[in-house]
């Protein structure tokens, strides 16, 4: 069985203010079972974006119907994006883990970029 | 609070069929899978059928697959199962249960009994 | 399959563990679900491997490794006298599978 890898295609993504940002990511496999998470920037300061498991996220919705038992698309739009939404947005697979879950693979990150709303 | 109510359950005799419905209330039921699962006088607890939050994705056991079809009308905030060719074997307590985020259970039902004999 | 032991007993406040075997630790999640009598509704005691619902009493636990899991209850109560049904659900193919379920009774 290939080991599973993540895949986000766009390396950057350009969108202006006010408007709604699509961040594609994609799984090659479901195993290890475990929930995705998505972060803006890297390391230990990285800020949680959407959590598969729980949380509640006004400004961010799934592309794909995440219930589907065979989705591999965790693709998320994020809403009214202001310059402080800039940044590299990294797509992270975990595997479960007791008591907490375990970093598996993360994608290559997309970098995104916010124009001034057009006048 | 979340509650799931089961009904549609009777006896009926062997090759009829059954409609079984389950209300939900207490939380958004169209951002969630469902499940039904049954249980037969003195056995243990059987998954039969599970349905994705937008109701596009169905999943069966094979001994139900073909006869039992799991659906869904997030505007009434009901799940269905449709039995086809019902034989005693299906006599069962039939529950609906709420899906986590991977597809196991937080919340039941009362369940529904559905008797099958001649 | 899952397989899980028949029965258990204890004495109240004693420690008990049931255990759940047969499932694949990267492709499954397991859960437990108690069943007080036959026919009544399941509650849900643990899902997520070791998750506890916010109105489950904390000397319920869950932890799964390898290709087993385990509900422990810590200081076991007359009132958990119950069935307890593990289930599992494989990522590899789509499917739910219960355990035949374990008589607990507390002495």
């Known amino acids: 069985e290939d080991e599973l890898q993540v895949i986000q295609p766009e390396k950057s993504v350009s969108v202006a203010a006010g408007e709604s940002a699509t961040l594609r990511c994609a799984m090659t496999s479901l195993i290890p079972v475990g929930p995705i998470m998505w972060f803006r920037g890297a390391g230990a300061g990285r800020e949680l974006i959407y959590n598969q498991k729980e949380g509640h996220f006004p400004r961010v919705t799934t592309v794909s119907e995440l219930t589907k038992r065979n989705n591999l698309d965790f693709s998320i739009s994020i809403s009214n994006i202001t310059p402080a939404d800039a940044g590299t947005y990294y797509c992270v697979k975990f595997r479960k883990g007791s008591p907490d879950d375990v970093e598996f693979k993360s994608g290559a990150g997309t970098e995104l970029s916010v124009r001034a709303k057009p006048s | 609070d979340v509650q799931l109510v089961e009904s549609g359950g009777g006896v009926v005799r062997p090759g009829e069929s059954l409609r079984l419905s389950c209300a939900a209330s207490?939380?958004?039921?169209?951002?969630?899978?469902m499940s039904w699962v049954r249980q037969a006088p003195g056995k243990g607890l059987e998954w039969l059928a599970g349905?994705?939050?937008?109701?596009?994705?169905?999943y069966y056991i094979d001994s139900v697959k073909g006869r039992f079809t799991i659906s869904r009308d997030n505007s009434k905030n009901s799940l269905y199962l449709q039995m086809n060719s019902l034989t005693a074997e299906d006599t069962a307590v039939y529950y609906c249960?709420?899906?986590?985020?991977?597809?196991?259970?937080?919340?039941w039902g009362l369940g529904t009994l559905v008797t099958v004999s001649s | 399959a899952l397989t899980q032991p028949a029965s258990v007993s204890a004495n109240p406040g004693e420690t008990v563990k049931i255990t759940c075997s047969g499932g694949?630790?990267?492709?499954?999640?397991y859960g437990w679900y108690q069943q007080k009598s036959p026919g009544s509704a399941p509650v849900t005691v643990i899902?997520?491997?070791?998750k506890r619902p916010s109105d489950i009493p904390s000397r319920f636990s869950g932890s799964a490794s390898g290709s087993a899991a385990t509900l422990t209850i810590t200081g076991v109560r007359v009132e958990d006298e119950a069935v307890y049904y593990c289930?599992?659900?494989?990522?590899?193919?789509?499917?739910?599978?219960f355990g035949a379920g374990t008589t607990l009774t507390v002495l």
């Open positions: 249960a709420r899906e986590t985020w991977n597809h196991l259970f937080d919340y």
């Open positions: 207490g939380f958004t039921f169209s951002s969630y899978a």
């Open positions: 349905i994705s939050a937008g109701g596009s994705d169905t």
């Open positions: 694949d630790w990267y492709s499954t999640y």
């Open positions: 899902h997520s491997d070791d």
């Open positions: 289930a599992g659900y494989d990522g590899r193919t789509y499917i739910n599978t």
